[in-house]
Interface confidence: low
């Protein structure tokens, strides 16, 4: 009876629900993640258990420090929801649900260039497309490693387009594009495409 009374007393302020979190919320399949289950009470020896839906994944003991569960998100159903249980003797509380968002990484985009050559100018159209990766995808175009466009968001699987007009250059210029989506710190780049300088018949991309 005393244990029950103690438990009921703890259920007020001393023993609130634990918090389940991860530094990484947007992941790709195959990614390792660390889930942190923490509790405001730093003086109790707490047993933490992690669940995905109703499946028990693991248990750790902790006192003052969060329990860390290292997982690999390999399949869609492993996105969640996850729940953490904090238990002291017969008292237990559950966290709110936590789910990951699985995003397919963008594959390296392909850059295509079309040029209309006039006597004085080059009218350049750049197309960039990543054929795989969760939408939306943000594309940015670069000339000689310097961004020349804002991020262009595409919500369907179609190429981003960027137009520019240049005076016929005397030097080669290198173009590439970057594709990124919601995956943090994950961007891919196209192969560079070099535009030769104007000298004779040296514009393989040109429509004249």
């Amino acid at each position: 009876r005393k244990a029950v009374l103690d438990c009921e007393a703890m259920k007020t302020n001393e023993f609130p629900s634990p918090c389940l979190d991860s530094k990484t919320k947007v992941v790709m399949k195959g990614q390792n993640v660390s889930m942190f289950c923490s509790h405001k009470n730093k003086s109790l020896q707490i047993t933490y258990s992690l669940f995905r839906r109703k499946t028990h994944l693991g248990t750790q003991d902790g006192k003052g420090e969060p329990a860390i569960f290292n997982l690999s998100i390999t399949e869609a159903h492993e996105s969640g929801p996850y729940k953490c249980k904090a238990q002291v003797t017969s008292c237990s509380k559950y966290s709110r649900d936590f789910s990951f968002t699985i995003v397919d990484p963008v594959t390296s985009p392909v850059l295509n260039i079309m040029v209309i050559q006039t006597e004085t100018d080059r009218h350049i159209t750049l197309h960039c497309l990543s054929v795989n990766g969760s939408l939306p995808i943000n594309y940015t175009f670069f000339e000689n490693h310097v961004a020349i466009s804002p991020a262009i968001s595409k919500y369907d699987r179609e190429p981003a387009e960027f137009n520019l007009t240049k005076k016929n250059p005397g030097e080669e210029e290198e173009y590439r594009c970057e594709a990124k989506n919601r995956l943090p710190n994950y961007a891919t780049y196209s192969h560079p495409v070099t535009m030769p300088s104007t000298g004779g018949d040296s514009c393989p991309f040109c429509l004249k």
């Epitope: 790709m28 399949k29 195959g30 990614q31 390792n32 690999s72 390999t74 397919d104 990484p105 594959t107 390296s108 392909v110 054929v131 795989n132 961007a187 891919t188 780049y189 196209s190 192969h191």
Partner: antibody, heavy 121, light 110 residues
Framework: EVQLVESGGGLVQPGGSLRLSCAAS????????MSWVRQAPGKCLEWIGT???????YYASWAKGRFTISRDNSKNTVYLQMNSLRAEDTAVYYC???????????????WGQGTLVTVSS | IQMTQSPSSLSASVGDRVTITCQAS??????LAWYQQKPGKAPKLLIY???TLESGVPSRFSGSGSGTDFTLTISSLQPEDFATYYC?????????????FGCGTKVTVL
């Protein structure tokens, strides 16, 4: 059915060159990274290099400079150009397809049957 | 990264439980695969991501471990399991790439 068939192996003199081919069928080569792996008689498997879907190539440190991987998506074929061959390059050469899964899961789900290269005078 | 397999060979009988270990020279997380190879044949994928069984592979094969130490276990050796087993670490990103194989463990009939 997914198939990889290597060809081009044979006897070559030290210092010579050879180009191996890997013909893919049952899938589109353009959407898969591919690797070459070799195995000397009675020895370990040894990774040579990988070519990505956009033709970026990666090589083992010992293979850089002598070995070149390329692909022709229109022919659904991957190539391994080998130059300045030495006796120690004698091995069965396999091409292998990286798994269809994502970047970090780059194990080999499909292998060819291998082609034997013998470097000897 | 170097992959060290042990033992290099072992003899066992049908029905035996067989354990093969693989050690990476630095932490590779769970980026490890196991292959089976029979004489004159190409390797066959058994396990990837350290512990995930490839489709069609019998459940007597299992993998475990993460970081630097990994294990392949055959719970009850069958006649068709006598072969050489290789571990492989893998890593591919936009900036670098490598794959490294262990030198194999040959499982022969006792």
């Amino acid at each position: 059915e997914v198939q990889l068939v290597e060809s081009g192996g044979g006897l070559v003199q030290p210092g010579g060159s050879l180009r191996l081919s890997c013909a893919a069928s049952g899938f589109s080569l353009s959407s898969h990274a591919m690797s070459w792996v070799r195995q000397a008689p009675g020895k370990c498997l040894e990774w040579i290099g990988t070519i990505s879907t956009i033709d970026t190539t990666y090589y083992a440190s010992w293979a850089k400079g002598r070995f070149t991987i390329s692909r022709d998506n229109s022919k659904n074929t991957v190539y391994l150009q080998m130059n300045s061959l030495r006796a120690e390059d004698t091995a069965v050469y396999y091409c292998a397809r990286l798994s269809e899964l994502y970047t970090t899961n780059s194990y080999y789900s499909r292998w060819g049957q291998g082609t034997l290269v013998t470097v000897s005078s | 990264i170097q992959m060290t397999q042990s033992p290099s060979s072992l003899s066992a009988s049908v029905g035996d439980r067989v354990t093969i270990t693989c050690q990476a020279s630095e932490s590779i997380g769970s980026l490890l695969a196991w292959y089976q190879q029979k004489p004159g044949k190409a390797p066959k994928l058994l396990i990837y991501r350290a512990s995930t069984l490839e489709s069609g592979v019998p459940s007597r094969f299992s993998g475990s471990g993460s970081g630097t130490d990994f294990t392949l276990t055959i719970s009850s050796l069958q006649p068709e399991d006598f072969a050489t087993y290789y571990c492989q670490s893998y890593h591919y990103s936009s900036s670098s790439s490598y794959a490294a194989f262990g030198c194999g463990t040959k499982v022969t009939v006792l």
